[in-house]
């Protein structure tokens, strides 16, 4: 009987078994971002490629309007990398002028939105001060962890400054999730 | 019946079930790199420890000649960390001389090679400008994501400068993949 | 028969199948650290939230006294992110004074302890020189990889300086593991 241990003496029934290839999965890749109005005090969300190149969604995991839609409850591994690039950060210019120097920063947040609850939940945050002296700087922030998600939850990736995101290559900036 | 939900009313048959312990998996760790000729405009590939210490390959996932060989089609989580270390980057020396300062950089790429297609595919890239003022610097770049791979695909890790890779400890620089 | 491929012609028996939802899993999040005595030449271990907010342990994966306890043998994906923050690093002060400048560093180690042997095994290390010029700096170190663990193994996260760990938000500093 499926879901029963080999040893028949103690009938230990698990949840229904299911093939791994049937699990919701998505890997989304960066596209050029269109400037959008975002709420004050809230980081803007990135939108993503979901079907071309390395990007895909499968088994009822859908992407729509910056969100990955969670089709069934369970434990998911969720990950993202955002590569940032910019010119000399403000911090080094301020420093050279001899004024107090709160460094610039770059931040990535993976956020969960649940329709039944108005406040988004920050699942993962990667935040880094940027005080580069060189004229052009670039660097990635990587995040990944496991979360218990509910059917209907929506995931998005927010960044501190959308204009600093490197959207040139699908391997540099990406976002994914898969049911464990 | 295996592959059928418990509720017999709607006979939902999945792909064949298989035990998780039977899935192709590998975790490779750093070894000292031997200088090799690499193609111009192509980053050199690292070679790896595959059987000693924390390194292993199992269930038909094999390592040969810098490549992880994918033994069956499916969705894989692929990851790598490379720790780089070096002396003061050129960029800071140039800066001190008051000249334009394009920063040095360090880059890791996880690349897929398919025999039937001549051009490698870059799956993941982590790239960072290095403009360190201190005399000795060191830092890791971590990458990880899910990809749909085909039987026969080969994975490798390329770096911008093999001489900057920290090969001293198996926990600092590594490369792995597992079938989901 | 459970554990047998659909094609009955060659009876290929795997290990017993089991539902994914039954697998040991944990995601732990940061809490404020209490200063503790730690052994000389050994990085201090962090302690963690295991049941509030985003944190959980399930299916016999337990957390106790800074350790995640591995309840069954198998291949696990283990991950952690530690966000560090501090004031201007010593290195830049030394540099300004014109003396040799060995940079400060921040380090995260995921360590395995096996009761049968007193010497811990370092599974993963992320280490980074810190030579920031700005007065306040902050940055994450992320680690994640797959390891073969035995029932009874214990995992912990060690850091080079506990006072630099950002314990303010559960999404910034975390530690997890799940059976594949």
């Amino acid at each position: 009987l499926k879901g029963q241990e080999f040893a028949p003496s103690h009938q230990q029934v698990y949840a229904p078994l299911r093939a791994d290839g049937d699990k919701p999965r998505a890997h989304l890749t960066v596209v050029r971002q269109t400037p959008t109005q975002h709420l004050k005090n809230q980081f803007p969300a990135l939108h993503w490629e979901h079907e071309l190149g390395l990007a895909f969604t499968k088994n009822r995991m859908n992407y729509t309007n910056k969100f990955l839609l969670i089709p069934e409850s369970g434990d998911y591994f969720v990950y993202s990398q955002v590569t940032f690039r910019g010119m000399t950060s403000e911090c080094s210019e301020i420093r050279q002028a001899g004024r107090p120097n709160k460094p610039d920063s770059i931040t990535v947040v993976i956020t969960k939105v649940t329709d039944s609850y108005p406040e988004p939940t920050q699942l993962l945050m990667g935040t880094k001060s940027v005080c580069e002296v060189g004229s052009n700087w670039f660097q990635p922030i990587y995040l990944g962890a496991m979360f218990s998600l509910q059917e209907g939850d929506k995931l998005m990736v927010n960044v501190s400054d959308i204009s600093l995101v490197d959207y040139t290559k699908e391997d540099k900036t990406f976002f994914g999730a898969f049911l464990l | 019946l295996k592959g059928q939900e418990f509720a017999p009313s709607h006979q939902q048959v999945y792909a064949p079930l298989r035990a998780d312990g039977d899935k192709p998996r590998a975790h490779l760790t750093v070894v000292r790199q031997t200088p090799t000729q690499h193609l111009k405009n192509q980053f050199p590939a690292l070679h790896w420890e595959h059987e000693l210490g924390l390194a292993f390959t199992k269930n038909r996932m094999n390592y040969t000649n810098k490549f992880l060989l994918i033994p069956e089609s499916g969705d894989y989580f692929v990851y790598s960390q490379v720790t780089f270390r070096g002396m003061t980057s050129e960029c800071s020396e140039i800066r001190q001389a008051g000249r334009p300062n394009k920063p040095d950089s360090i880059t890791v790429v996880i690349t897929k090679v398919t025999d039937s297609y001549p051009e490698p595919t870059q799956l993941l890239m982590g790239t960072k400008s290095v403009c360190e003022v201190g005399s000795n610097w060191f830092q890791p770049i971590y990458l990880g994501a899910m990809f749909s791979l085909q039987e026969g695909d080969k994975l490798m890790v390329n770096v911008s400068d093999i001489s900057l890779v920290d090969y001293t400890k198996e926990d600092k620089t590594f490369f792995g993949a597992f079938l989901l | 028969l459970k554990g047998q491929e659909f094609a009955p012609s060659h009876q290929q028996v795997y290990a017993p199948l089991r539902a994914d939802g039954d697998k040991p899993r944990a995601h732990l999040t940061v809490v404020r650290q209490t200063p503790t005595q730690h052994l000389k030449n050994q990085f201090p271990a962090l302690h963690w939230e295991h049941e509030l907010g985003l944190a959980f342990t399930k299916n016999r994966m337990n957390y106790t006294n800074k350790f995640l306890l591995i309840p069954e043998s198998g291949d696990y994906f283990v991950y952690s992110q530690v966000t560090f923050r501090g004031m201007t690093s010593e290195c830049s002060e030394i540099r300004q004074a014109g003396r040799p400048n060995k940079p400060d560093s921040i380090t995260v180690v995921i360590t395995k302890v096996t009761d049968s042997y007193p010497e811990p095994t370092q599974l993963l290390m992320g280490t980074k020189s810190v030579c920031e010029v700005g007065s306040n700096w902050f940055q994450p170190i992320y680690l994640g990889a797959m390891f073969s663990l035995q029932e009874g193994d214990k995992l912990m996260v060690n850091v080079s300086d506990i006072s630099l760990v950002d314990y303010t938000k559960e999404d910034k500093t975390f530690f997890g593991a799940f059976l594949l």
Epitope: - | V31, T34 | S148
Partner: antibody, heavy 119, light 106 residues
Framework: QVQLVQSGAEVKKPGASVKVSCKAS????????MNWVRQAPGQNLEWIGL????????NYNQKFKGRATLTVDTSISTAYMELSRLRSDDTAVYYC????????????WGQGTLVTVSS | EIVLTQSPDFQSVTPKEKVTITCSAS?????MHWYQQKPDQSPKLLIK???KLASGVPSRFSGSGSGTDFTLTINSLEAEDAATYYC?????????FGGGTKVEIK
């Protein structure tokens, strides 16, 4: 201190099998890979294969594949080498020997087990 | 497989004399080690990774080489150095040993 203690000498008939044990102490058993090396009387060292107790992974010298089986019992820090279908030219001293990483060489050796194959 | 050829097979040397043993590989090797084996004893690691002295080994022993050609040198032979010396490569499986060089004290 590190010790690898092997089982005692064996006399076997051609066609039989022999299983040699090697108990490790004084170091992390799963942290080192166990090799098996043999030396026929007056002859050179010959590498049979290795087993990594951490992962259970094995690698055999093709010459011994199908005849040698390497196993470990991590709960008692013991490695085993079984050689089947013994021939007279398998008469040798069999050593277990552990290595950490390949640049370290084989640092620890057992005392050896003499296996004599004779009809 | 990589074949390691040691020379000489045998050397009879007076104490305080310098001994040089060579190990030639049939293809390039990254990891070469040297072992000493005395009669009725297990081998003992002498030189690891071409040139690094193993723990407790006297400084009169040294190793050098790269690629396919490696050398073990005993700078000033002592009576206790009478033994057979083996090279071993850890670059490519199977991890082969050289044929051995027996060093005898005159």
């Amino acid at each position: 201190q590190v010790q690898l203690v092997q089982s005692g000498a064996e006399v076997k008939k051609p066609g039989a099998s022999v299983k040699v044990s090697c108990k490790a102490s004084g170091y992390s058993f799963t942290g080192y890979t166990m090799n098996w090396v043999r030396q026929a009387p007056g002859q050179n060292l010959e590498w049979i294969g290795l087993i990594n107790p951490y992962s259970g992974g094995t690698n055999y010298n093709q010459k011994f594949k199908g005849r040698a089986t390497l196993t470990v019992d991590t709960s008692i820090s013991t490695a085993y080498m079984e050689l089947s279908r013994l021939r007279s030219d398998d008469t040798a001293v069999y050593y277990c020997a552990s290595i950490y990483q390949r640049h370290d060489g084989i640092a620890y050796w057992g005392q050896g087990t003499l296996v004599t194959v004779s009809s | 497989e990589i074949v390691l050829t040691q020379s000489p097979d045998f050397q009879s040397v007076t104490p305080k004399e310098k001994v040089t043993i060579t190990c030639s590989a049939s293809s390039s090797v990254n990891y070469m080690h040297w072992y000493q084996q005395k009669p009725d004893q297990s081998p003992k690691l002498l030189i690891k990774d071409t040139s690094k002295l193993a723990s407790g080994v006297p400084s009169r022993f040294s190793g050098s080489g790269s690629g396919t050609d490696f050398t073990l040198t005993i700078n000033s032979l002592e009576a206790e150095d009478a033994a057979t010396y083996y090279c071993q490569q850890w670059s490519s499986s199977p991890y082969t040993f050289g044929g051995g060089t027996k060093v005898e004290i005159k």
